[in-house]
């Protein structure tokens, strides 16, 4: 797009560039132990890693941002690794009347890109 | 959302937190001088600044990310400042038959949040 082409191979070495990673967290970590019943331990996937020039660029804006960061690093930040999509998860909540299930569409990352 | 509440006031001082900023760029900067027409420098708006705890959190995932970054800073990165929306802009392209207009929906940021 716009005559700059994103790339998918990491020039920094395996596991260094923007990717999805699983992080373990307890309800206590999240401050949720008073209102979520289960799961007690959450497997959360998050986007981690660096965004070197043109790697997994989200869109035209990210391609431009990468280019300008190379020219004006103090003024324009490098693109950073953020979710491109999410996977829905269900949490079991305590409620006044007992227990309910609630789906969260934006809690667990499913894919990552550099924006 | 999810018992964590994003906030909109910057604890780091004016202009330090995630916000929209206008950046000037030439066609040469972008590598576009052979295929885009422009008599002036281009103005681009980009998302810059830090994302301190719970500031302008994009969604539940970002709220959790902020919390876990506080607990596991080496493992979980802080949220970062990225576009929440874009504004469509028009570029004048050189073509074989002269000049044409093309709209880009993802080139200029319109709003920012921490993801």
């Amino acid at each position: 797009s716009a005559h700059l082409h994103p790339r998918d191979s990491c020039p920094l070495g395996p596991g260094r560039c923007c990717h999805l990673e699983t992080v373990q967290a307890t309800l206590e970590d999240l401050g949720w132990s008073d209102w979520v019943l289960s799961p007690r331990q959450l497997q959360l996937s998050m986007c981690v890693g660096e965004c070197p020039h043109l790697y997994r660029s989200a869109n035209t804006h990210a391609l431009i941002k990468a280019r300008l960061h190379g020219l004006q690093p103090d003024r324009v930040p490098a693109p950073c690794c953020v979710p491109s999509s999410y996977t829905p998860v269900v949490l079991m909540h305590r409620t006044d009347s007992g227990v309910s299930l609630q789906t969260y569409d934006d809690l667990v990352a499913q894919g990552c890109h550099c924006a | 959302s999810a018992h964590l509440h994003p906030r909109d006031s910057c604890p780091l001082g004016p202009g330090r937190c995630c916000h929209l900023e206008t950046v000037q760029a030439t066609l040469e900067d972008l590598g576009w001088s052979d295929w885009v027409l422009s008599p002036r420098q281009l103005q681009l708006s980009m998302c810059v600044g830090e994302c301190p705890h719970l500031y302008r959190s994009a969604n539940t995932h970002a709220l959790i990310k902020a919390r876990l970054h506080g607990l596991q800073p080496d493992r979980v990165p802080a949220p970062c400042c990225v576009p929440s929306s874009y504004t469509p802009v028009v570029l004048m392209h050189r073509t074989d038959s002269g000049v044409s207009l093309q709209t880009y929906d993802d080139l200029v940021a319109q709003g920012c949040h921490c993801a």
Partner: antibody, heavy 123, light 108 residues
Framework: QVQLVQSGAEVKKPGSSVKVSCKAS????????VSWVRQAPGQGLEWMGG????????NYAQKFQGRVTITADESTSTAYMELSSLRSEDTAVYYC????????????????WGQGTLVTVSS | SYELTQPLSVSVALGQTARITCSGD??????VSWYQQKPGQAPVLVIY???NRPSGIPERFSGSNSGNTATLTISRAQAGDEADYYC??????????FGGGTKLTVLG
């Protein structure tokens, strides 16, 4: 549906200033370029300048440089055009017009127009 | 500064084809837009980027542009097409330039 609603007609003395407003509704105000175009009685269209709220910058036609100030208030989705040192030749209908942001050119392709504001300069 | 020259007036018989020209130095390498303005009303964009029409503008309106002349063509002219027509482009520093306008009269 996009609408541009301008302030009412004005009668001004030579040497004074006039400020005309243009309130936008429908669409995202900051995402477009707003220009001011005037038309003297029986004459053609003349571009005066414009502003792009998202960039916060205004550009002016050379003819009006130093005499016109164009501003925008995003909180009210309103653009303003102030013309100073008025003379009789400034008697005209003043239009605000909206178009997409054209990178490097900024203004043009005016797809929505206000109803016009008649400014009469007379002693 | 860049100048666009239009004929002051053009007449066309009802149902026939009207052509309104806009002359400028090497205008064929410019993007040109056309506006229609009826008496007492604000202008309306009818053609942009050679021959693109905004929604609501009939297919009878088309544009072309080459050399030193851009042309707005209105086929099967109707009484409601009677109006002033303005071409628009940009000068070398990116400022908006309008032509002087052409009054279209539909006869019959």
């Amino acid at each position: 549906q996009v609408q541009l609603v301008q302030s009412g007609a004005e009668v001004k003395k030579p040497g004074s200033s006039v400020k005309v407003s243009c309130k936008a509704s429908g669409g995202t105000f900051r995402s477009y370029a707003v220009s001011w175009v005037r038309q003297a009685p029986g004459q053609g269209l003349e571009w005066m300048g414009g502003i792009i709220p998202i960039f916060g910058t205004a550009n002016y036609a050379q003819k009006f440089q130093g005499r016109v100030t164009i501003t925008a208030d995003e909180s009210t989705s309103t653009a303003y055009m102030e013309l100073s040192s008025l003379r009789s030749e400034d008697t005209a209908v003043y239009y605000c017009a909206r178009g997409p942001i054209i990178m490097g050119y900024q203004f043009g392709l005016f797809d929505h127009w206000g109803q016009g504001t008649l400014v009469t300069v007379s002693s | 500064s860049y100048e666009l020259t239009q004929p002051l007036s053009v007449s066309v018989a009802l149902g026939q084809t009207a052509r309104i020209t806009c002359s400028g130095d090497n205008i064929g390498s410019h993007i040109v837009s056309w506006y229609q303005q009826k008496p007492g009303q604000a202008p309306v964009l009818v053609i942009y980027d050679k021959s693109n029409r905004p929604s609501g503008i009939p297919e009878r309106f088309s544009g072309s542009n080459s050399g030193n002349t851009a042309t707005l063509t209105i086929s099967r002219a109707q009484a409601g097409d009677e109006a002033d027509y303005y071409c628009q482009t940009w000068d070398s520093i990116g400022s908006v330039v309008f032509g002087g306008g052409t009054k279209l009269t539909v006869l019959g």
